[in-house]
């Protein structure tokens, strides 16, 4: 049967993003409509037809445009994505003979990790703190020269949609750690990044 092929996209906050739909059909549609899926009912964003060209709804005027003006292949582009743009979008191809054929493409917004790594001596122990803030939530691991070192992790969600994960490494005999390298590993969207810290006696 006639279907629409789509692909989900993941893009960085405050960058452009494009969503594409392709009607797998011998014939073009009469009109293409893009809608944002909402809890109650979908919200019309933009339409394209031969009769009227591109018609963008006021709420989306400065946010999007149709960048592939096709009635078989249609692409919308967000100029500068925000967290509010995250979600799923429907493309509806109104075809002659077979009515509205729809596809759904979802947009996920990510924020690259911002990482801070520092240490602090206090009396008889050493605390090394690694904090990573990102979207979706990152994971923090430690690579240390020897085993048996304790760590504690705190997760904090921010109103802007990012999450901070802070892990503190508790070293009870700090003298053994001086001059040695500790690695904080941050895992985000399948990529592990190493952040290295050599401990010097202050």
């Amino acid at each position: 049967q006639v279907q629409v092929v789509t692909q989900d996209e993941r893009e960085q906050l405050y960058t452009p993003a494009s969503l594409k739909c392709s009607l797998q059909n011998a014939q073009e549609a009469l009109i293409v409509t893009w809608q944002k899926k909402k809890a109650v009912s979908p919200e019309n964003m933009v339409t394209f037809s031969e009769n009227h060209g591109v018609v963008i709804q006021p709420a989306y005027k400065d946010k999007i445009n149709i960048t592939q003006l096709g009635l078989q292949n249609s692409t919308i582009t967000f100029w500068n994505i925000t967290l509010e743009d995250e979600g799923c979008y429907m493309c509806l191809f109104n075809t002659f003979g077979f009515g509205k054929i729809s596809g759904t493409a979802c947009l996920t917004v990510y924020v690259q990790p911002i990482v801070s790594l520092h240490y602090k001596f206090s009396e008889d122990h050493l605390n090394i703190t690694c904090s990573a803030t990102a979207r979706p939530a990152p994971m923090v691991f430690w690579k240390v020269p020897r085993s048996g070192i304790e760590n504690s992790t705190v997760t904090l969600s921010h109103p802007n949609g990012t999450t901070s994960v802070t892990s503190i490494l508790h070293i009870k005999d700090p003298k053994n750690q001086v001059g040695k390298e500790v690695i904080c590993q941050v895992l985000h969207l399948g990529t592990v990044t190493d952040f290295k810290q050599t401990v010097n006696k202050g």
Partner: antibody, heavy 117, light 107 residues
Amino acid sequence: QVQLVQSGAEVKKPGASVKVSCKASGYSFTDYIILWVRQAPGQRLEWMGHIDPYYGSSNYNLKFKGRVTITRDTSASTAYMELSSLRSEDTAVYYCGRSKRDYFDYWGQGTLVTVSS
Amino acid sequence: DIQMTQSPSSLSASVGDRVTITCKASQDINSYLSWFQQKPGKAPKSLIYRANRLVDGVPSRFSGSGSGQDFTLTISSLQPEDFATYYCLQYDEFPYTFGQGTKLEIK
């Protein structure tokens, strides 16, 4: 040149079935929808249904309550319209046509189906 | 189903006359309307699609207008070959439906 040639006239008894063919030539068969309309004597045209030969997807007028089936044979560039459980009011001229989206340009010559006991 | 009502049902006119046939849909059909010409014993011939677009090869004396529920077919100067029956067709919603036809006769 583009042609849609339909099969010849048929006389059928009530309750029987009829299968009308529409052979396309002069163009790529899968690029155009094939549609079927009929016209009973002195009546308006009536859309029966259509098929997209590319996928074989079809759509029917529910008025016919499952009595109509539209198929195609891409290797023979031919579309078929079968109407079952015939009754006297199915006596009509049946036309096939082709369309690219909503652009109708060529039609068959029509096939008269007479339903009579 | 969407009902299509044409008016008038029949019309007498002379060669050279300007003729207007109207078609009213029972609900909004956007611009998804075609006009056909049919002569006795012949297949319909498409004249106009999408309310106002002329089919290739159709003389420019034929024109279509309208959107929503009200549509018009105009023949600016009748020619002898224009005497026929004219049908409108809506294809906004399935099943697609034709008007009852307007028979255009020579006065």
